[in-house]
C-alpha cells in the first residue's frame, strides 16, 4: 500500500481468482483513544472499533472510503483504490491501446517545434468518475523540470456503438535549448483513477522523435505565361523554430486529381517554391518534415488548381 | 526517406555538401546495423545515449546561431579552445566564434574517425562476420575532415591486446552510431546556417 | 472453490459451426480476464482468445482471427466461444482458462472437425 | 508460430537432477513472467511455476524456477516417476499482451 496523496492510498493487489488479498491497518487520524468506530462508503453499518482496523482487501467491494467517528462526528477518512496485477502486467482497463505507432501504445505526444514544449493524448471510453494527473520530467534517476498542465477533454467522437473521449496535456521543459543533442529522454506519467481503480501510463520519448511541424503557411499559385505550370510558393509555419537555416525544413509538392484513384505527382525540395502542373479541378497540398532528422511529416497544407 | 542531394554551386559554402553526404551515409549505417543486429539491443528506445566527445569539444555551444545565444539554457561553458586555420573559412566570414565551431567538428569528426576505425578492425576478427563499417562513410568522414583541413595532432589508433568480446563490441557500434547520427544532425544544421549566413 | 465446466465440443463437418461454453464458479467471475486455450492431438499448447472482464476487448490467434468468436454473459458467468467455418486444423481439445499468476483450467472438450 | 524454444524431450533416472530450458527473445521472456506448466496424458496442464520462480501452494519444492535474460528454466531436483510429463513455458510479448505464448513443450521421462 502507498500513497498517492492525502488520505488517498493505493493497494496493490495480484488479481487472480480467490486470491488472498491483502491486509491493510488502516488508523484514525486523532488524538482520541476510545469510542471511535468505522464504516464504509455510505454503510452505516460498522465494521470494527477502535483507533485501527484491519481489513483484508481482495475485491473492489472491499476498496472505498473508510471514516472513522465519534458520536456521530467523523474524525478522518482514508480512501482506499486497487492496483490490479494480472500475471505480472499492471492493468491497462482504463485507457485504450492507440496501436500506433506500435502496440501498446496508450499515451501519444508530438511537439510542434524544438522549443520544449509538447503535448500527449490518450484516449478512453469511459465518460464519468474519471481524473487524471499527469507528471513529466526529463530523465529519472536526476530528473530535470517539465511543468505539466492540467488534462482536459480535448474531443470526443462516435467509433460504431461506443463514444470514445480524447484527454489532452501540454507540458513544458523548464530549461530548454532548442539546439540541445538530447541524451535523456522526456519521461511523461499519467495517473489514472476510474471510481475506485488506479492506474498509471508512462511514456518515454525525445523530443526529436516526437516533432510533427505545423502545415507550410501562405501556400499560392502563381500561373506560368504561356504554360499549364503554376510556381506554387508557401513559407515556413509560425511555429516553427528559428532561425530557419538552421532549422531546416524538407517539403513535399504533390499534386492530386478530384479522384483519389488518379495518379498523384510528388516532388520534394528544400525551397519554398516548386513549378509543378497544375491540371484541371486538381489540387495543390505541400507538407514539410525536419530536413535533417526523420520524424513526422506535416499534414498537408492544399489549394485548388483552379 | 533518402535525404534530397544538394549539388552545390561554386559558391556555395563548400563544408555543406559533405555535411549533406556525412549525414546520409550515417543514416544508411545506422538502418543497416538495426536490421542486421535485430537480436541485439539497437533501437533509440533501447540503447545508452553516450556521446564520446563529451567534456573533450562543445560543438553545440560554440556553433550556436546568434538567434540563440539570447537563450540561457542554450548557454553552458564554452571554454574549449581551438586552432584556427579551417580552409572553410571563405576569409570574409572568418570570425572567431565560426572557427571555433569548425574546429569542434574537426575534433568530433576525428573522435569519430578513431573509434569506428577501431570497432572495425574488431569486428573484422568475428567468425560471424555479421556487419562491418559501411567504407563509403568512413570515406565521407575523411572528405569533411579534409574539407575542413585544420591542423591537429594525429591520434594513434587505440589497439586492444585481449580477446574482443564481439556481442559488446555490436551494441557499441549501435551506441556510436546513434550518438554520431545526432552529431551529423548538428553539423548539418550548422553548415546550412553558416552557408546562410 | 473456484470451478470452470466445459460443453459444447464433438464432431462436426468442415465448413459448419460450434459453440463452446465454460460455466464458471467459485469466483467472481465478472472480474477476470478469460482465455481459450486449445491442444491438436499429440501436439503442444496453442492460445486462442482472450476476453477483457468486462467483455469490452477481445484478442485472437491470427490461426481463427475472422472465424472465431470469443465472448462472455457475466450475468449468467459464462464463457463462449463461437467457431465458424471450421477446418480439419482446428481438431483439438479446447480449454478455458482464467487470466492471472494463478490460473484454473477447464475439464477441456474434445472438437473434431472431419467429413 | 512457437516464439519459445524448448528441447523436445529431457530424461533422468530417479532421483537425478533435470533442467528444461525455455529459450525467447527481448521483447517476451526478456520483458515479461514466466510459467511453467506440468501436463499429464489425457488431463488440463497444471501450474507449477508463476513470476519466473514461484511455486503455487500444493507443489513439491523439488520443482523451482529461474529466468535470465532471455532464458528461463525449470529445475526438478531430485526427479520421480510421477514427475514423468509434458512441461510447457509460458509467457508474453509486450506487443501482443495478453496472448499467451506457449514453448514447444519438453516430455521429461523417468528413466528405470
Known amino acids: 500500500i502507498w500513497e498517492l496523496k492525502k488520505d488517498v492510498y493505493v493497494v496493490e493487489l495480484d488479481w487472480y481468482p480467490d486470491a488472498p488479498g491483502e491486509m491493510v491497518v488502516l488508523t484514525c487520524d486523532t488524538p482520541e483513544e476510545d469510542g471511535i468506530t468505522w464504516t464504509l462508503d455510505q454503510s452505516s453499518e460498522v465494521l470494527g472499533s477502535g483507533k485501527t482496523l484491519t481489513i483484508q482487501v481482495k475485491e473492489f467491494g472491499d476498496a472505498g472510503q473508510y471514516t472513522c467517528h465519534k458520536g456521530g462526528e467523523v474524525l478522518s477518512h482514508s480512501l482506499l483504490l486497487l492496483h490490479k496485477k494480472e500475471d505480472g502486467i499492471w492493468s491497462t482497463d482504463i485507457l485504450k491501446d492507440q496501436k500506433e505507432p506500435k502496440n501498446k501504445t496508450f499515451l501519444r505526444c508530438e511537439a510542434k517545434n524544438y522549443s520544449g514544449r509538447f503535448t500527449c493524448w490518450w484516449l478512453t471510453t469511459i465518460s464519468t468518475d474519471l481524473t487524471f494527473s499527469v507528471k513529466s520530467s526529463r530523465g529519472s534517476s536526476d530528473p530535470q523540470g517539465v511543468t505539466c498542465g492540467a488534462a482536459t477533454l480535448s474531443a470526443e467522437r462516435v467509433r460504431g456503438d461506443n463514444k470514445e473521449y480524447e484527454y489532452s496535456v501540454e507540458c513544458q521543459e523548464d530549461s530548454a535549448c532548442p539546439a540541445a543533442e538530447e541524451s535523456l529522454p522526456i519521461e511523461v506519467m499519467v495517473d489514472a483513477v476510474h471510481k475506485l481503480k488506479y492506474e498509471n501510463y508512462t511514456s518515454s520519448f525525445f523530443i526529436r522523435d516526437i516533432i510533427k511541424p505545423d502545415p507550410p503557411k501562405n501556400l499560392q499559385l502563381k500561373p506560368l505565361k504561356n504554360s499549364r505550370q503554376v510556381e506554387v510558393s508557401w513559407e515556413y509555419p509560425d511555429t516553427w523554430s528559428t532561425p530557419h537555416s538552421y532549422f531546416s525544413l524538407t517539403f513535399c509538392v504533390q499534386v492530386q486529381g478530384k479522384s483519389k484513384r488518379e495518379k498523384k505527382d510528388r516532388v520534394f525540395t528544400d525551397k519554398t517554391s516548386a513549378t509543378v502542373i497544375c491540371r484541371k479541378n486538381a489540387s495543390i497540398s505541400v507538407r514539410a518534415q525536419d530536413r535533417y532528422y526523420s520524424s513526422s511529416w506535416s499534414e498537408w497544407a492544399s489549394v485548388p488548381c483552379s | 526517406r533518402n535525404l534530397p542531394v544538394a549539388t552545390p554551386d561554386p559558391g556555395m559554402f563548400p563544408c555543406l555538401h559533405h555535411s549533406q553526404n556525412l549525414l546520409r551515409a550515417v543514416s544508411n549505417m545506422l538502418q543497416k546495423a538495426r536490421q542486421t543486429l535485430e537480436f541485439y539491443p539497437c533501437t533509440s528506445e533501447e540503447i545508452d545515449h553516450e556521446d564520446i566527445t563529451k567534456d573533450k569539444t562543445s560543438t553545440v555551444e560554440a556553433c550556436l546561431p546568434l538567434e540563440l545565444t539570447k537563450n540561457e539554457s542554450c548557454l553552458n561553458s564554452r571554454e574549449t579552445s581551438f586552432i584556427t586555420n579551417g580552409s572553410c573559412l571563405a576569409s570574409r566570414k572568418t570570425s572567431f566564434m565560426m572557427a571555433l565551431c569548425l574546429s569542434s567538428i574537426y575534433e568530433d569528426l576525428k573522435m569519430y574517425q578513431v573509434e569506428f576505425k577501431t570497432m572495425n578492425a574488431k569486428l573484422l576478427m568475428d567468425p560471424k562476420r555479421q556487419i562491418f563499417l559501411d567504407q563509403n562513410m568512413l570515406a565521407v568522414i575523411d572528405e569533411l575532415m579534409q574539407a575542413l583541413n585544420f591542423n591537429s595532432e594525429t591520434v594513434p589508433q587505440k589497439s586492444s591486446l585481449e580477446e574482443p568480446d564481439f556481442y559488446k563490441t555490436k551494441i557499441k557500434l549501435c551506441i556510436l552510431l546513434h550518438a554520431f547520427r545526432i552529431r551529423a544532425v548538428t553539423i548539418d544544421r550548422v553548415m546550412s546556417y553558416l552557408n546562410a549566413s | 472453490q473456484v470451478q470452470l465446466v466445459q460443453s459444447g465440443g464433438g464432431v462436426v463437418q468442415p465448413g459448419r459451426s460450434l459453440r463452446l461454453s465454460c460455466a464458471a464458479s467459485g469466483f467472481t467471475f465478472s472480474s477476470y480476464g478469460m482465455h481459450w486455450v486449445r491442444q491438436a492431438p499429440g501436439k503442444g499448447l496453442e492460445w486462442v482468445a482472450f476476453i477483457r472482464y468486462d467483455g469490452s476487448n477481445k484478442y485472437y490467434a491470427d490461426s481463427v482471427k475472422g472465424r472465431f468468436t470469443i465472448s462472455r454473459d457475466n450475468s449468467k458467468n459464462t464463457l463462449y466461444l463461437q467457431m465458424k467455418s471450421l477446418r480439419a486444423e482446428d481438431t483439438a481439445v479446447y480449454y478455458c482458462k482464467t487470466h492471472g499468476s494463478h490460473d484454473n483450467w477447464g475439464q477441456g472438450t474434445m472438437v473434431t472437425v472431419s467429413s | 508460430s512457437y516464439v519459445l524454444t524448448q528441447p523436445p524431450s529431457v530424461s533422468g533416472t530417479p532421483g537425478q537432477r533435470v533442467t528444461i530450458s525455455c529459450s525467447g527473445g527481448r521483447s517476451n521472456i526478456g520483458s515479461n513472467v514466466v510459467k511453467w506448466y506440468q501436463q499429464l496424458p489425457g488431463t488440463a496442464p497444471k501450474l507449477l511455476i508463476y513470476?519466473?520462480?514461484q511455486r503455487p501452494s500444493g507443489v513439491p519444492d523439488r520443482f523451482s524456477g529461474s529466468k535470465s535474460g532471455t532464458s528461463a528454466s525449470l529445475a526438478i531436483t531430485g526427479v520421480q516417476a510421477e514427475d514423468e510429463a509434458d512441461y510447457y513455458c509460458q509467457s508474453y510479448d509486450r506487443g501482443t499482451h495478453p496472448a499467451l505464448l506457449f514453448g514447444t513443450g519438453t516430455k521429461v521421462t523417468v528413466l528405470g
Open positions: 513470476g519466473n520462480d
